[in-house]
């Protein structure tokens, strides 16, 4: 797959951390947010500290997504829920792909047809309701340096 030029981690060796990012969802302009209690949603506030995310390359094209302030890892659960866990599990890895429109998608490595996605209201979308071509799965990585 193509690799993100700015926001992706796919071109970097395993264990490599890039600068913190904010993931901007095309569907409504929400930034992906990881709360300290493990909840995941979207917010339209660039100053929210919980949108600062660390993308770490596990292997080429595979990343984990950690909320810097929450100190938790984004996870796709077997029922399609998105939440953030304190420890890295096999549910915390995602295939990162740069799509032709320059947005990234993050597809679960464990549940391979499910994507990280935000609804138009800012709530997360169940993995089981996601699929290719949806605006909800498209994310633009942006710098989170402050």
């Amino acid at each position: 797959p193509a690799l993100p030029e700015d926001g992706g981690s796919g071109a970097f060796p395993p264990g490599h951390f890039k600068d913190p990012k904010r993931l901007y969802c095309k569907n409504g302009g929400f930034f992906l947010r990881i709360h300290p209690d493990g909840r995941v949603d979207g917010v339209r506030e660039k100053s929210d500290p919980h949108i600062k995310l660390q993308l770490q390359a596990e292997e080429r094209g595979v990343v984990s997504i950690k909320g810097v302030c929450a100190n938790r890892y984004l996870a796709m659960k077997e029922d399609g829920r998105l939440l953030a866990s304190k420890c890295v599990t096999d549910e915390c890895f995602f295939f990162e792909r740069l799509e032709s429109n320059n947005y990234n998608t993050y597809r679960s490595r464990k549940y391979t047809s499910w994507y990280v996605a935000l609804k138009r209201t800012g709530q997360y979308k169940l993995g089981s309701k996601t699929g290719p071509g949806q605006k909800a799965i498209l994310f633009l990585p942006m710098s989170a340096k402050s």
Partner: antibody, heavy 121, light 107 residues
Framework: EVQLVQSGAEVKKPGSSVKVSCKAS????????INWVRQAPGQGLEWIGY????????KYNEKFKGRATITSDKSTSTAYMELSSLRSEDTAVYYC??????????????WGQGTTVTVSS | DIQMTQSPSSLSASVGDRVTITCKAS??????VGWYQQKPGKAPKLLIY???NRYSGVPSRFSGSGSGTDFTLTISSLQPEDFATYYC?????????FGQGTKVEIK
């Protein structure tokens, strides 16, 4: 081509209300937030708030909370900004502006022509 | 609220001059600053977004730089159509706030 066409100039008495409209065309109205910004004569720009036409959810500058009401009508692709309890300091040009979205994020990339509101007794 | 302080408030320049306008935020706003151009009786127009990115169709003589608290708009070679008022704006913290404007006049 994106167009935002605003309603005409208004002259209002202190204490009354004004409702300015902004009709959008050339894009999918529910995909982008509409901001409202005002400019007093000879002064700078001041953000009032925005409305998301998708679910009619609004966010306000605290300064205008309780006095400004920003709404939208999906069926006519029109955004509205109503300001109540008008005072002379509210005399200004009021602009609607669409957010850019995508790589432009929240930058305002298309603006209405402005509506002059004069508050005078 | 975040204060955006522009300087100078006005300047006189000639066609072909290099013009620099600065904007200082009262606290860090990351790189989330835009620049707008406004001519008398007209609505503002977006020039620069996210600190340093030129908006579609904006001439290359306009450039933006900076992050944190200090931002700059540069016009490399002033053209007759560039005489206008320029505003910086931050959208990092709510409420979004603008600078007071810099009027660029003909010398």
């Amino acid at each position: 081509e994106v167009q935002l066409v605003q309603s005409g100039a208004e002259v209002k008495k202190p204490g009354s209300s004004v409702k300015v409209s902004c009709k959008a065309s050339g894009y999918t109205f529910t995909n982008y937030v509409i901001n409202w910004v005002r400019q007093a004569p000879g002064q700078g720009l001041e953000w009032i708030g925005y409305n998301d036409p998708y679910n009619d959810v609004s966010k306000y500058n605290e300064k205008f909370k309780g006095r400004a009401t920003i709404t939208s009508d999906k069926s006519t692709s029109t955004a509205y900004m109503e300001l109540s309890s008008l005072r002379s300091e509210d005399t200004a040009v009021y602009y609607c502006a669409k957010e850019g979205g995508g790589k432009y994020v929240y930058a305002m990339d298309s603006w209405g022509q402005g509506t002059t509101v004069t508050v005078s007794s | 609220d975040i204060q955006m302080t522009q300087s100078p408030s006005s300047l006189s320049a000639s066609v072909g001059d290099r013009v620099t306008i600065t904007c200082k935020a009262s606290q860090s706003v990351s790189s989330d600053v835009g620049w707008y151009q406004q001519k008398p009786g007209k609505a503002p127009k977006l020039l620069i977004y996210s600190g340093s990115n030129r908006y579609s169709g904006v001439p290359s003589r306009f450039s933006g730089s900076g992050s944190g608290t200090d931002f700059t708009l540069t016009i490399s070679s002033l053209q007759p159509e560039d005489f206008a008022t320029y505003y910086c704006q931050q959208d990092y913290y709510s409420p979004w706030t603008f600078g007071q404007g810099t009027k660029v006049e003909i010398k």
